[in-house]
Amino acid sequence: TTSAEKNTCQLYIQTDHLFFKYYGTREAVIAQISSHVKAIDTIYQTTDFSGIRNISFMVKRIRINTTADEKDPTNPFRFPNIGVEKFLELNSEQNHDDYCLAYVFTDRDFDDGVLGLAWVGAPSGSSGGICEKSKLYSDGKKKSLNTGIITVQNYGSHVPPKVSHITFAHEVGHNFGSPHDSGTECTPGESKNLGQKENGNYIMYARATSGDKLNNNKFSLCSIRNISQVLEKKRNNCFVESGQPICGNGMVEQGEECDCGYSDQCKDECCFDANQPEGRKCKLKPGKQCSPSQGPCCTAQCAFKSKSEKCRDDSDCAREGICNGFTALCPASDPKPNFTDCNRHTQVCINGQCAGSICEKYGLEECTCASSDGKDDKELCHVCCMKKMDPSTCASTGSVQWSRHFSGRTITLQPGSPCNDFRGYCDVFMRCRLVDADGPLARLKKAIFSPELYENIAE
Protein backbone atom coordinates (compact mmCIF):
# COMPACT_ATOMS: atom_id res chain seq x y z
CA THR A 1 0.00 0.00 0.00
CA THR A 2 1.23 3.49 -0.79
CA SER A 3 1.26 5.88 2.14
CA ALA A 4 -1.00 8.93 1.78
CA GLU A 5 0.90 12.03 0.79
CA LYS A 6 1.47 14.92 3.15
CA ASN A 7 -0.03 17.64 1.00
CA THR A 8 -2.14 19.80 3.33
CA CYS A 9 -0.93 22.99 4.98
CA GLN A 10 -2.91 23.70 8.15
CA LEU A 11 -3.63 27.35 8.86
CA TYR A 12 -4.24 29.48 11.91
CA ILE A 13 -6.21 32.55 10.88
CA GLN A 14 -6.72 35.51 13.17
CA THR A 15 -8.69 38.65 12.36
CA ASP A 16 -8.32 41.98 14.14
CA HIS A 17 -11.08 44.23 15.48
CA LEU A 18 -10.98 46.43 12.36
CA PHE A 19 -11.70 43.47 10.10
CA PHE A 20 -14.62 42.59 12.38
CA LYS A 21 -15.82 46.20 12.36
CA TYR A 22 -15.97 46.19 8.56
CA TYR A 23 -17.76 42.84 8.16
CA GLY A 24 -20.00 43.27 11.20
CA THR A 25 -20.61 39.75 12.53
CA ARG A 26 -18.64 36.63 13.46
CA GLU A 27 -20.47 34.72 10.73
CA ALA A 28 -19.57 37.28 8.07
CA VAL A 29 -15.92 37.22 9.20
CA ILE A 30 -15.85 33.41 9.06
CA ALA A 31 -17.39 33.55 5.58
CA GLN A 32 -14.52 35.84 4.52
CA ILE A 33 -11.90 33.53 6.02
CA SER A 34 -13.55 30.56 4.31
CA SER A 35 -13.72 32.29 0.92
CA HIS A 36 -10.05 33.32 1.07
CA VAL A 37 -8.89 29.84 2.05
CA LYS A 38 -11.06 28.15 -0.59
CA ALA A 39 -9.70 30.54 -3.21
CA ILE A 40 -6.04 29.76 -2.49
CA ASP A 41 -6.88 26.08 -2.10
CA THR A 42 -8.23 26.07 -5.66
CA ILE A 43 -5.16 27.89 -7.00
CA TYR A 44 -2.59 25.66 -5.31
CA GLN A 45 -4.49 22.38 -5.91
CA THR A 46 -4.58 23.06 -9.64
CA THR A 47 -0.87 23.89 -9.87
CA ASP A 48 1.70 21.22 -10.61
CA PHE A 49 4.80 22.16 -8.62
CA SER A 50 7.29 20.15 -10.67
CA GLY A 51 5.52 16.87 -9.90
CA ILE A 52 4.22 17.82 -6.45
CA ARG A 53 0.46 18.04 -6.90
CA ASN A 54 -2.74 18.58 -4.91
CA ILE A 55 -1.28 21.00 -2.39
CA SER A 56 -4.24 22.02 -0.26
CA PHE A 57 -5.10 24.19 2.73
CA MET A 58 -7.22 23.61 5.78
CA VAL A 59 -8.12 25.99 8.58
CA LYS A 60 -7.08 24.35 11.84
CA ARG A 61 -8.12 27.18 14.13
CA ILE A 62 -9.41 30.74 13.97
CA ARG A 63 -9.43 33.64 16.37
CA ILE A 64 -11.77 36.54 15.74
CA ASN A 65 -10.99 39.73 17.63
CA THR A 66 -14.25 41.67 17.81
CA THR A 67 -14.73 45.36 18.57
CA ALA A 68 -15.05 44.27 22.22
CA ASP A 69 -11.39 43.17 22.08
CA GLU A 70 -10.20 46.64 21.02
CA LYS A 71 -9.19 47.44 24.60
CA ASP A 72 -8.20 43.93 25.66
CA PRO A 73 -4.54 44.02 26.78
CA THR A 74 -4.08 40.38 25.69
CA ASN A 75 -5.00 41.30 22.10
CA PRO A 76 -1.74 42.17 20.34
CA PHE A 77 -3.56 43.68 17.35
CA ARG A 78 -5.55 46.25 19.36
CA PHE A 79 -3.42 49.28 18.46
CA PRO A 80 -5.00 51.65 15.91
CA ASN A 81 -1.99 52.98 14.02
CA ILE A 82 0.52 50.25 13.25
CA GLY A 83 2.73 50.07 10.19
CA VAL A 84 2.72 46.94 8.09
CA GLU A 85 6.07 45.62 9.36
CA LYS A 86 5.05 46.06 13.00
CA PHE A 87 1.73 44.37 12.28
CA LEU A 88 3.51 41.33 10.84
CA GLU A 89 5.89 41.35 13.78
CA LEU A 90 2.99 41.25 16.26
CA ASN A 91 1.77 38.11 14.52
CA SER A 92 5.28 36.64 14.54
CA GLU A 93 5.71 37.25 18.29
CA GLN A 94 3.12 34.54 18.99
CA ASN A 95 4.08 30.87 19.01
CA HIS A 96 2.68 29.21 15.88
CA ASP A 97 4.46 25.85 16.12
CA ASP A 98 1.16 23.96 15.77
CA TYR A 99 0.54 25.32 12.29
CA CYS A 100 2.00 25.28 8.82
CA LEU A 101 1.20 29.00 8.47
CA ALA A 102 -0.42 31.67 10.66
CA TYR A 103 -2.11 34.72 9.13
CA VAL A 104 -3.82 37.84 10.36
CA PHE A 105 -6.52 39.53 8.27
CA THR A 106 -7.14 43.23 8.81
CA ASP A 107 -8.90 46.24 7.35
CA ARG A 108 -6.10 48.80 7.60
CA ASP A 109 -4.82 51.22 4.99
CA PHE A 110 -1.09 50.57 5.03
CA ASP A 111 1.30 53.00 3.37
CA ASP A 112 2.28 52.86 -0.30
CA GLY A 113 -0.40 50.48 -1.56
CA VAL A 114 0.84 47.53 0.49
CA LEU A 115 -1.86 44.83 0.66
CA GLY A 116 0.15 42.19 2.48
CA LEU A 117 3.47 41.10 3.90
CA ALA A 118 4.98 37.68 4.58
CA TRP A 119 8.20 35.89 5.40
CA VAL A 120 9.79 34.14 2.44
CA GLY A 121 10.57 30.45 2.64
CA ALA A 122 13.80 28.95 1.33
CA PRO A 123 14.87 25.33 0.77
CA SER A 124 17.62 25.47 3.39
CA GLY A 125 19.03 27.65 6.14
CA SER A 126 15.90 29.74 5.99
CA SER A 127 14.32 31.84 8.65
CA GLY A 128 10.74 32.10 7.53
CA GLY A 129 7.98 30.50 5.54
CA ILE A 130 6.09 27.23 5.81
CA CYS A 131 6.70 24.97 8.81
CA GLU A 132 9.17 27.40 10.43
CA LYS A 133 9.28 26.86 14.20
CA SER A 134 9.45 29.51 16.91
CA LYS A 135 12.99 30.43 17.90
CA LEU A 136 15.08 33.13 19.52
CA TYR A 137 16.36 35.91 17.24
CA SER A 138 19.09 38.47 17.64
CA ASP A 139 16.75 41.09 19.08
CA GLY A 140 16.28 38.78 22.08
CA LYS A 141 12.70 37.83 21.19
CA LYS A 142 11.25 34.46 20.26
CA LYS A 143 9.45 34.61 16.94
CA SER A 144 7.47 32.37 14.62
CA LEU A 145 8.26 33.29 11.05
CA ASN A 146 5.71 30.97 9.42
CA THR A 147 3.55 34.06 9.20
CA GLY A 148 1.95 36.68 7.01
CA ILE A 149 -0.72 39.37 7.03
CA ILE A 150 -3.18 40.75 4.50
CA THR A 151 -5.45 43.78 4.43
CA VAL A 152 -8.62 44.35 2.43
CA GLN A 153 -8.18 48.11 2.18
CA ASN A 154 -6.09 50.20 -0.21
CA TYR A 155 -6.04 54.00 -0.45
CA GLY A 156 -9.32 54.28 1.43
CA SER A 157 -11.20 51.79 -0.76
CA HIS A 158 -11.97 48.14 -0.19
CA VAL A 159 -10.36 45.85 -2.71
CA PRO A 160 -12.59 43.45 -4.69
CA PRO A 161 -12.69 39.87 -3.36
CA LYS A 162 -10.82 38.51 -6.40
CA VAL A 163 -7.93 40.91 -5.68
CA SER A 164 -7.91 40.05 -1.98
CA HIS A 165 -7.87 36.32 -2.80
CA ILE A 166 -4.88 36.87 -5.10
CA THR A 167 -3.15 38.95 -2.40
CA PHE A 168 -3.53 36.00 -0.02
CA ALA A 169 -2.23 33.56 -2.66
CA HIS A 170 0.69 35.98 -3.28
CA GLU A 171 1.69 36.23 0.39
CA VAL A 172 1.36 32.48 0.87
CA GLY A 173 3.47 32.15 -2.29
CA HIS A 174 6.24 34.03 -0.45
CA ASN A 175 5.89 31.64 2.51
CA PHE A 176 6.21 28.75 0.05
CA GLY A 177 9.49 30.15 -1.23
CA SER A 178 8.65 32.35 -4.18
CA PRO A 179 10.20 35.80 -4.53
CA HIS A 180 8.57 38.38 -6.80
CA ASP A 181 8.40 37.57 -10.49
CA SER A 182 11.05 39.15 -12.67
CA GLY A 183 12.32 38.81 -16.23
CA THR A 184 10.37 38.79 -19.46
CA GLU A 185 9.21 35.16 -19.18
CA CYS A 186 7.55 35.74 -15.82
CA THR A 187 6.21 39.30 -16.21
CA PRO A 188 4.28 39.09 -19.51
CA GLY A 189 2.07 42.01 -18.48
CA GLU A 190 5.09 44.29 -18.94
CA SER A 191 5.69 43.01 -22.47
CA LYS A 192 5.58 45.29 -25.52
CA ASN A 193 3.96 42.35 -27.35
CA LEU A 194 0.21 42.97 -27.16
CA GLY A 195 -0.65 39.26 -27.37
CA GLN A 196 1.47 38.46 -24.31
CA LYS A 197 0.52 41.61 -22.45
CA GLU A 198 -3.24 41.07 -22.61
CA ASN A 199 -3.04 37.95 -20.40
CA GLY A 200 -1.55 40.04 -17.60
CA ASN A 201 0.95 39.19 -14.90
CA TYR A 202 1.12 36.18 -12.62
CA ILE A 203 0.36 35.86 -8.89
CA MET A 204 3.84 36.85 -7.73
CA TYR A 205 4.04 40.09 -9.75
CA ALA A 206 5.59 42.70 -7.49
CA ARG A 207 3.23 45.58 -8.08
CA ALA A 208 -0.51 45.89 -8.83
CA THR A 209 -3.13 43.44 -10.06
CA SER A 210 -6.72 43.77 -11.24
CA GLY A 211 -7.41 40.06 -10.69
CA ASP A 212 -9.35 39.59 -13.90
CA LYS A 213 -6.67 38.71 -16.44
CA LEU A 214 -5.90 35.14 -17.46
CA ASN A 215 -2.53 34.91 -15.67
CA ASN A 216 -3.55 36.82 -12.54
CA ASN A 217 -4.46 33.72 -10.54
CA LYS A 218 -1.74 31.44 -11.90
CA PHE A 219 1.84 30.93 -10.79
CA SER A 220 4.62 31.70 -13.24
CA LEU A 221 7.26 29.12 -14.11
CA CYS A 222 9.68 31.17 -11.99
CA SER A 223 7.42 30.78 -8.95
CA ILE A 224 6.82 27.10 -9.64
CA ARG A 225 10.57 26.44 -9.76
CA ASN A 226 11.16 28.18 -6.43
CA ILE A 227 8.12 26.77 -4.65
CA SER A 228 8.79 23.19 -5.72
CA GLN A 229 12.29 23.34 -4.21
CA VAL A 230 10.89 24.50 -0.87
CA LEU A 231 8.06 21.96 -0.90
CA GLU A 232 10.55 19.19 -1.63
CA LYS A 233 12.57 20.07 1.47
CA LYS A 234 9.97 21.38 3.91
CA ARG A 235 6.55 19.82 3.47
CA ASN A 236 7.37 16.69 5.46
CA ASN A 237 8.14 18.92 8.46
CA CYS A 238 4.55 20.00 9.04
CA PHE A 239 2.16 19.21 6.18
CA VAL A 240 -0.49 16.60 6.98
CA GLU A 241 -2.46 14.08 4.98
CA SER A 242 -5.65 15.64 3.70
CA GLY A 243 -8.81 14.12 4.96
CA GLN A 244 -11.05 14.66 7.90
CA PRO A 245 -12.77 18.01 8.45
CA ILE A 246 -11.67 19.88 11.55
CA CYS A 247 -14.53 20.42 13.97
CA GLY A 248 -13.77 23.66 15.81
CA ASN A 249 -12.43 25.76 12.94
CA GLY A 250 -15.73 27.64 12.57
CA MET A 251 -16.37 26.36 9.06
CA VAL A 252 -19.09 23.84 8.31
CA GLU A 253 -17.34 21.08 6.37
CA GLN A 254 -18.29 17.68 4.98
CA GLY A 255 -20.03 15.60 7.66
CA GLU A 256 -20.62 18.49 10.08
CA GLU A 257 -24.06 19.96 10.77
CA CYS A 258 -22.64 23.15 12.24
CA ASP A 259 -19.37 24.50 13.68
CA CYS A 260 -19.31 27.21 16.30
CA GLY A 261 -15.66 26.66 17.31
CA TYR A 262 -14.25 25.49 20.63
CA SER A 263 -15.99 26.07 23.95
CA ASP A 264 -14.08 29.31 24.60
CA GLN A 265 -15.30 30.75 21.28
CA CYS A 266 -18.75 29.25 20.78
CA LYS A 267 -21.47 31.87 21.32
CA ASP A 268 -24.06 29.69 19.64
CA GLU A 269 -27.03 28.18 21.50
CA CYS A 270 -27.75 25.90 18.56
CA CYS A 271 -24.60 23.87 18.02
CA PHE A 272 -22.53 21.55 20.20
CA ASP A 273 -19.00 23.01 20.42
CA ALA A 274 -15.82 21.21 19.44
CA ASN A 275 -14.96 20.26 23.03
CA GLN A 276 -18.02 18.01 23.29
CA PRO A 277 -17.76 14.22 22.95
CA GLU A 278 -17.28 12.69 19.51
CA GLY A 279 -20.93 11.90 18.76
CA ARG A 280 -22.15 15.39 19.63
CA LYS A 281 -19.54 17.92 18.56
CA CYS A 282 -20.40 19.99 15.48
CA LYS A 283 -23.96 18.68 15.53
CA LEU A 284 -27.16 20.68 16.03
CA LYS A 285 -28.59 20.54 19.54
CA PRO A 286 -31.86 18.60 19.83
CA GLY A 287 -34.91 20.51 18.59
CA LYS A 288 -32.86 23.24 16.89
CA GLN A 289 -33.64 23.99 13.24
CA CYS A 290 -30.31 25.54 12.33
CA SER A 291 -27.17 27.30 13.54
CA PRO A 292 -25.94 30.76 12.50
CA SER A 293 -22.69 29.00 11.53
CA GLN A 294 -24.61 27.45 8.61
CA GLY A 295 -25.52 30.76 7.05
CA PRO A 296 -27.09 34.18 7.55
CA CYS A 297 -30.72 33.00 7.39
CA CYS A 298 -30.61 31.40 10.85
CA THR A 299 -31.49 33.41 13.95
CA ALA A 300 -29.56 33.35 17.23
CA GLN A 301 -32.60 31.45 18.53
CA CYS A 302 -31.79 28.61 16.11
CA ALA A 303 -34.76 29.07 13.78
CA PHE A 304 -34.84 29.84 10.06
CA LYS A 305 -35.41 33.51 9.36
CA SER A 306 -38.75 34.35 7.80
CA LYS A 307 -39.37 34.58 4.07
CA SER A 308 -39.11 38.36 3.76
CA GLU A 309 -35.86 38.95 5.66
CA LYS A 310 -32.94 40.38 3.72
CA CYS A 311 -29.70 38.40 3.96
CA ARG A 312 -27.59 40.16 1.34
CA ASP A 313 -27.66 43.78 0.28
CA ASP A 314 -28.59 44.82 -3.21
CA SER A 315 -25.28 45.35 -5.05
CA ASP A 316 -24.35 47.18 -8.22
CA CYS A 317 -24.83 43.99 -10.23
CA ALA A 318 -27.19 41.71 -8.30
CA ARG A 319 -30.50 42.13 -6.54
CA GLU A 320 -30.74 41.71 -2.78
CA GLY A 321 -30.78 38.25 -1.24
CA ILE A 322 -33.93 37.28 0.65
CA CYS A 323 -34.25 34.39 3.10
CA ASN A 324 -36.77 31.75 2.07
CA GLY A 325 -37.80 30.37 5.45
CA PHE A 326 -36.50 26.82 5.00
CA THR A 327 -32.70 27.03 4.99
CA ALA A 328 -29.91 28.95 6.72
CA LEU A 329 -28.35 29.70 3.31
CA CYS A 330 -28.90 33.09 1.74
CA PRO A 331 -30.28 32.12 -1.68
CA ALA A 332 -28.68 33.29 -4.90
CA SER A 333 -30.29 36.42 -6.33
CA ASP A 334 -30.89 37.39 -9.92
CA PRO A 335 -28.26 39.41 -11.76
CA LYS A 336 -28.94 42.92 -12.98
CA PRO A 337 -28.85 43.36 -16.77
CA ASN A 338 -25.46 43.12 -18.48
CA PHE A 339 -23.79 46.49 -19.10
CA THR A 340 -25.46 48.12 -16.09
CA ASP A 341 -22.94 50.69 -14.77
CA CYS A 342 -21.15 49.66 -11.57
CA ASN A 343 -18.25 50.66 -9.32
CA ARG A 344 -19.20 54.33 -9.63
CA HIS A 345 -19.59 54.23 -13.41
CA THR A 346 -16.06 52.91 -14.03
CA GLN A 347 -17.17 49.37 -14.87
CA VAL A 348 -20.16 47.37 -16.12
CA CYS A 349 -21.97 44.29 -14.89
CA ILE A 350 -21.35 41.00 -16.70
CA ASN A 351 -23.40 38.01 -15.49
CA GLY A 352 -24.06 39.56 -12.11
CA GLN A 353 -20.43 40.52 -11.47
CA CYS A 354 -18.90 43.99 -11.71
CA ALA A 355 -16.27 42.76 -14.12
CA GLY A 356 -16.10 44.65 -17.39
CA SER A 357 -14.85 48.16 -18.08
CA ILE A 358 -17.25 51.00 -18.89
CA CYS A 359 -15.44 51.08 -22.26
CA GLU A 360 -17.07 47.75 -23.16
CA LYS A 361 -20.48 49.41 -23.08
CA TYR A 362 -19.48 51.19 -26.28
CA GLY A 363 -17.63 48.34 -27.99
CA LEU A 364 -14.26 49.69 -26.83
CA GLU A 365 -11.51 48.17 -24.69
CA GLU A 366 -10.00 49.64 -21.55
CA CYS A 367 -6.38 50.73 -21.85
CA THR A 368 -3.87 52.43 -19.60
CA CYS A 369 -3.05 56.05 -20.11
CA ALA A 370 0.54 55.11 -19.30
CA SER A 371 3.26 57.71 -18.97
CA SER A 372 5.67 55.59 -21.04
CA ASP A 373 3.46 56.48 -24.04
CA GLY A 374 4.14 60.15 -23.40
CA LYS A 375 0.72 60.69 -21.85
CA ASP A 376 0.15 63.37 -19.26
CA ASP A 377 0.65 62.01 -15.72
CA LYS A 378 -2.67 63.61 -14.79
CA GLU A 379 -4.42 61.04 -16.97
CA LEU A 380 -2.98 57.98 -15.24
CA CYS A 381 -6.04 57.75 -12.99
CA HIS A 382 -8.56 58.38 -15.73
CA VAL A 383 -10.53 55.53 -17.26
CA CYS A 384 -9.07 55.31 -20.77
CA CYS A 385 -10.53 53.47 -23.75
CA MET A 386 -9.25 52.36 -27.13
CA LYS A 387 -10.62 50.68 -30.24
CA LYS A 388 -10.22 46.91 -29.94
CA MET A 389 -6.59 45.82 -30.40
CA ASP A 390 -5.52 49.35 -31.41
CA PRO A 391 -3.43 50.96 -28.63
CA SER A 392 -2.75 54.01 -30.80
CA THR A 393 -6.37 55.08 -30.14
CA CYS A 394 -6.02 54.94 -26.33
CA ALA A 395 -7.45 58.13 -24.83
CA SER A 396 -9.14 59.35 -21.66
CA THR A 397 -12.92 59.16 -21.36
CA GLY A 398 -12.76 62.95 -21.06
CA SER A 399 -11.03 63.34 -24.42
CA VAL A 400 -12.60 64.79 -27.58
CA GLN A 401 -12.04 61.41 -29.24
CA TRP A 402 -14.65 59.69 -27.04
CA SER A 403 -16.96 62.68 -26.48
CA ARG A 404 -19.84 61.00 -28.35
CA HIS A 405 -19.87 58.28 -25.69
CA PHE A 406 -18.94 60.21 -22.55
CA SER A 407 -19.94 63.79 -23.52
CA GLY A 408 -16.57 65.13 -22.42
CA ARG A 409 -17.08 63.79 -18.87
CA THR A 410 -13.86 62.38 -17.41
CA ILE A 411 -14.47 59.14 -15.57
CA THR A 412 -11.77 58.62 -12.95
CA LEU A 413 -10.64 55.30 -11.53
CA GLN A 414 -11.64 54.43 -7.98
CA PRO A 415 -8.96 55.01 -5.31
CA GLY A 416 -7.02 51.76 -4.96
CA SER A 417 -7.43 50.86 -8.65
CA PRO A 418 -4.31 49.73 -10.58
CA CYS A 419 -2.83 52.43 -12.82
CA ASN A 420 0.12 53.10 -15.15
CA ASP A 421 0.14 49.58 -16.57
CA PHE A 422 -0.17 47.93 -13.13
CA ARG A 423 2.88 49.77 -11.78
CA GLY A 424 0.87 51.45 -9.06
CA TYR A 425 -2.48 52.35 -7.50
CA CYS A 426 -4.57 55.52 -7.63
CA ASP A 427 -4.75 57.45 -4.39
CA VAL A 428 -7.69 59.58 -3.18
CA PHE A 429 -6.26 62.62 -5.01
CA MET A 430 -6.29 60.69 -8.31
CA ARG A 431 -2.52 60.47 -8.44
CA CYS A 432 -0.99 57.21 -9.56
CA ARG A 433 1.26 56.15 -6.70
CA LEU A 434 3.90 53.65 -7.78
CA VAL A 435 4.15 50.57 -5.59
CA ASP A 436 7.55 50.31 -3.97
CA ALA A 437 7.52 46.53 -3.89
CA ASP A 438 10.43 46.32 -1.50
CA GLY A 439 9.67 49.33 0.72
CA PRO A 440 9.09 47.41 3.95
CA LEU A 441 12.32 45.53 3.26
CA ALA A 442 14.29 48.75 3.32
CA ARG A 443 12.56 49.89 6.50
CA LEU A 444 13.26 46.58 8.19
CA LYS A 445 16.97 47.08 7.65
CA LYS A 446 16.73 49.87 10.20
CA ALA A 447 14.71 47.67 12.53
CA ILE A 448 15.38 44.79 14.83
CA PHE A 449 16.37 41.90 12.60
CA SER A 450 19.89 40.74 12.04
CA PRO A 451 21.28 41.30 8.53
CA GLU A 452 20.98 37.67 7.41
CA LEU A 453 17.19 37.93 7.68
CA TYR A 454 16.74 40.91 5.40
CA GLU A 455 16.17 38.86 2.31
CA ASN A 456 13.48 36.73 3.90
CA ILE A 457 10.61 39.15 4.15
CA ALA A 458 8.54 40.34 1.25
CA GLU A 459 5.30 42.00 0.25
Epitope: S35, P161, Q254, Q294, G295, T327, P335, G352
Partner: nanobody
Protein backbone atom coordinates in the same frame (compact mmCIF):
# COMPACT_ATOMS: atom_id res chain seq x y z
CA UNK B 1 -14.88 30.48 -13.74
CA UNK B 2 -17.35 27.83 -12.60
CA UNK B 3 -19.59 26.48 -15.34
CA UNK B 4 -22.68 24.57 -14.32
CA UNK B 5 -24.55 22.30 -16.74
CA UNK B 6 -28.01 21.04 -15.80
CA UNK B 7 -29.60 18.04 -17.52
CA UNK B 8 -32.30 15.41 -17.06
CA UNK B 9 -35.40 17.51 -17.65
CA UNK B 10 -38.24 16.49 -19.93
CA UNK B 11 -41.95 15.92 -20.27
CA UNK B 12 -43.49 13.64 -17.66
CA UNK B 13 -46.99 12.78 -16.55
CA UNK B 14 -48.31 13.83 -13.16
CA UNK B 15 -47.22 11.31 -10.53
CA UNK B 16 -44.09 10.44 -12.49
CA UNK B 17 -40.42 10.90 -11.59
CA UNK B 18 -37.34 12.62 -12.99
CA UNK B 19 -33.75 12.85 -11.85
CA UNK B 20 -31.96 16.09 -12.66
CA UNK B 21 -28.17 16.30 -12.77
CA UNK B 22 -25.86 19.26 -12.38
CA UNK B 23 -22.27 18.84 -13.50
CA UNK B 24 -19.31 21.14 -12.92
CA UNK B 25 -15.63 21.09 -13.71
CA UNK B 26 -13.35 20.41 -10.74
CA UNK B 27 -14.42 19.18 -7.31
CA UNK B 28 -16.27 22.38 -6.40
CA UNK B 29 -19.20 20.67 -4.69
CA UNK B 30 -17.08 19.44 -1.76
CA UNK B 31 -17.46 21.72 1.28
CA UNK B 32 -19.57 24.19 -0.70
CA UNK B 33 -23.28 24.86 -0.38
CA UNK B 34 -25.48 23.87 -3.33
CA UNK B 35 -29.03 24.81 -4.24
CA UNK B 36 -31.61 23.68 -6.77
CA UNK B 37 -33.84 26.51 -7.98
CA UNK B 38 -36.76 26.72 -10.37
CA UNK B 39 -38.46 29.42 -12.38
CA UNK B 40 -42.01 28.95 -13.60
CA UNK B 41 -43.28 31.18 -16.44
CA UNK B 42 -43.99 34.70 -15.18
CA UNK B 43 -42.67 33.93 -11.69
CA UNK B 44 -39.52 34.73 -9.72
CA UNK B 45 -36.77 32.15 -9.52
CA UNK B 46 -37.08 30.29 -6.20
CA UNK B 47 -34.94 27.83 -4.29
CA UNK B 48 -36.56 24.42 -3.79
CA UNK B 49 -33.76 22.38 -2.21
CA UNK B 50 -30.50 23.19 -0.47
CA UNK B 51 -27.50 21.18 0.59
CA UNK B 52 -25.27 22.91 3.11
CA UNK B 53 -21.49 22.69 2.93
CA UNK B 54 -21.49 19.93 5.55
CA UNK B 55 -24.07 17.85 3.68
CA UNK B 56 -27.26 18.71 5.62
CA UNK B 57 -30.32 19.22 3.41
CA UNK B 58 -33.35 21.54 3.49
CA UNK B 59 -36.46 21.66 1.30
CA UNK B 60 -39.22 24.11 0.46
CA UNK B 61 -42.58 23.02 1.91
CA UNK B 62 -43.99 22.61 -1.60
CA UNK B 63 -41.54 19.79 -2.42
CA UNK B 64 -40.79 18.29 1.00
CA UNK B 65 -41.12 14.50 0.97
CA UNK B 66 -41.12 14.38 -2.84
CA UNK B 67 -37.73 15.85 -3.84
CA UNK B 68 -34.27 14.75 -2.68
CA UNK B 69 -31.00 16.61 -3.22
CA UNK B 70 -27.75 14.62 -3.19
CA UNK B 71 -24.21 14.89 -4.43
CA UNK B 72 -21.56 12.57 -5.79
CA UNK B 73 -18.17 14.16 -5.10
CA UNK B 74 -16.32 11.61 -7.21
CA UNK B 75 -18.39 12.57 -10.26
CA UNK B 76 -18.51 16.30 -9.42
CA UNK B 77 -22.26 16.09 -9.81
CA UNK B 78 -25.30 17.17 -7.78
CA UNK B 79 -28.69 15.54 -8.28
CA UNK B 80 -32.32 16.38 -7.67
CA UNK B 81 -34.53 13.30 -7.50
CA UNK B 82 -38.14 14.40 -8.13
CA UNK B 83 -40.96 11.96 -7.33
CA UNK B 84 -44.75 12.32 -7.38
CA UNK B 85 -44.46 15.24 -9.77
CA UNK B 86 -47.36 17.71 -10.05
CA UNK B 87 -48.32 20.11 -12.85
CA UNK B 88 -47.28 22.99 -10.58
CA UNK B 89 -43.71 21.66 -10.61
CA UNK B 90 -43.47 22.72 -14.28
CA UNK B 91 -40.55 25.15 -14.56
CA UNK B 92 -36.98 25.59 -15.73
CA UNK B 93 -34.72 24.07 -13.04
CA UNK B 94 -31.28 25.48 -12.24
CA UNK B 95 -28.57 24.42 -9.85
CA UNK B 96 -26.08 26.78 -8.26
CA UNK B 97 -23.09 26.47 -5.95
CA UNK B 98 -21.46 28.90 -3.54
CA UNK B 99 -17.81 29.25 -4.52
CA UNK B 100 -15.56 31.42 -2.33
CA UNK B 101 -18.68 32.67 -0.57
CA UNK B 102 -20.44 33.80 -3.75
CA UNK B 103 -23.05 32.00 -5.81
CA UNK B 104 -21.78 31.07 -9.26
CA UNK B 105 -23.30 32.44 -12.45
CA UNK B 106 -26.48 30.73 -13.58
CA UNK B 107 -26.34 27.93 -16.11
CA UNK B 108 -28.87 27.41 -18.91
CA UNK B 109 -31.19 25.30 -16.76
CA UNK B 110 -33.24 22.27 -17.77
CA UNK B 111 -36.95 22.37 -18.62
CA UNK B 112 -39.34 20.16 -16.63
CA UNK B 113 -42.91 19.91 -17.88
CA UNK B 114 -45.50 17.94 -15.93
CA UNK B 115 -48.70 17.21 -17.81
CA UNK B 116 -51.96 16.33 -16.11
Amino acid sequence: KVQLVESGGGLVQAGGSLRLSCAASGNIFINNAVGWYRQAPGKQREMVAAMLSGGSTNYADSVKGRFTISRDNAKNTVYLQMNSLKPEDTAVYYCNVQVNGTWARWGQGTQVTVSS
